[in-house]
């Protein structure tokens, strides 16, 4: 029985050219996290592994930075970055927990109206 829950930053918006932090948090379980994967639709962005640390996919190396914590920082945002992002927690013994974040990248003037969704 999986008792844990994933809390995420939910639906967020950010300005084109800016940066955003994607963050998830696993709670309500004593399970041990062995690896966290960050994915955009079906593309792997990054892995944080208990043994090996961080690995950023080569195609995202210029625009993705690890952290803070198990989160992921996306930089130099473009409108094409709009979409769903998933944090996938591999745990022992529970198995896999998945959290979803929807990011909307907006033109500068529009993003100001959505600022309340941004992470400080």
């Amino acid at each position: 029985m999986m008792t844990g829950t994933i809390e995420t930053t939910g639906n967020i918006s950010a300005e084109k050219g800016g940066s955003i932090i994607l963050q998830c948090h696993l709670s309500s379980t004593t399970a041990q996290v062995t690896q966290v994967n960050w994915e955009q639709q079906d593309q792997l962005l990054a892995i944080c592994n208990a043994d090996l640390g961080w690995h950023i996919s080569p195609s995202f190396k210029d625009r993705v930075a690890p952290g803070p914590g198990l989160g992921l920082t996306l930089q130099s945002l473009t409108v094409n970055d709009t979409g769903e992002y998933f944090c996938i927690y591999h745990t022992y013994p529970d198995g896999t927990y998945t959290g979803r974040i929807f990011l909307e990248v907006l033109e500068s003037s529009v993003a100001e109206h959505g600022a309340r969704f941004q992470i400080p």
Epitope: M1, T30, Q32, V33, T34, Q35, N49, A50, D51, P93
Partner: antibody, heavy 121, light 108 residues
Framework: EVKLEESGGGLVQPGGSMKLSCVAS????????MDWVRQSPEKGLEWVAE??????????NYGESVKGRFTISRDDSKSSVYLQMNNLRAEDSGIYYC????????????WGQGTTLTVSS | QIVLTQSPAIMSASPGEKVNLTCSAS???????LYWYQQKPGSSPKLWIY???TLASGVPARFSGSGSGTSYSLTISNMEAEDAASYFC?????????FGGGTKLEMK
């Protein structure tokens, strides 16, 4: 060959302090979650504390009877885990075991041979 | 905290006999978090069964584990001399993690 070696036990007066150390070899220490477990004739096996891996934010958790008195820490560069024990009581006496657990598709669980702590005046 | 009660506290079995050790929890334990350890005098505990029913490396197939919720058991299908030891159940489903008081299994 997997090895966990505890040290630092001995005789200490009530109210005193002691630091236990455990050095690990033969497995990927940074990926292992580490515990201290103690054993005494009076209380049997008793979980003392754990420290998780970096991916678990090196989170620490403690047994009720040692909370606020004991501190667990780790140094991945030295493959070592420590237990700082303050304000020791007679009931803290026992054999202290270091335990390492690891999951990389299979689950592994390793224990040291233990170090004995005696709290007595 | 979850209290684990093991029974019997001491038991003896003849060679070839079927042995059943039980572990009763004061509240529900998730099965993936229920372990059994074997300990022989002068040695540290050894992982014997994890996740309720998975045998640790090197554990003979005559051992098995089962259970769910608040009731768990370790079974030896046919007792052998090397099985004489103490067996402890352990849960890490909730804090603080706890161990049972153990069952000392002796050879008749």
């Amino acid at each position: 060959e997997v090895k966990l070696e505890e040290s630092g036990g001995g005789l200490v007066q009530p109210g005193g302090s002691m630091k236990l150390s455990c050095v690990a070899s033969g497995f990927t220490f940074s990926g292992a979650w580490m515990d201290w477990v103690r054993q005494s004739p009076e209380k049997g096996l008793e979980w003392v504390a754990e420290i998780r891996t970096k991916v678990n934010n090196h989170a620490t958790n403690y047994g009720e009877s040692v909370k606020g008195r004991f501190t667990i820490s780790r140094d991945d560069s030295k493959s070592s885990v420590y237990l700082q024990m303050n304000n020791l009581r007679a009931e803290d006496s026992g054999i202290y075991y270091c335990r390492g657990a690891l999951y990389d598709g299979f689950y592994f669980d390793y224990w040291g041979q233990g170090t004995t702590l005696t709290v007595s005046s | 905290q979850i209290v684990l009660t093991q029974s019997p506290a001491i038991m003896s079995a003849s060679p070839g006999e079927k042995v059943n050790l039980t572990c009763s929890a004061s509240s529900s334990v998730s099965s993936g978090y229920l372990y059994w350890y074997q300990q022989k005098p002068g040695s540290s505990p050894k992982l014997w069964i994890y996740g309720t029913s998975t045998l640790a490396s090197g554990v003979p197939a005559r051992f098995s584990g089962s259970g769910s919720g608040t009731s768990y058991s370790l079974t030896i299908s046919n007792m052998e001399a090397e099985d004489a030891a103490s067996y402890f159940c352990h849960q890490w489903s909730s804090f603080p993690y706890t161990f049972g008081g153990g069952t000392k299994l002796e050879m008749k």
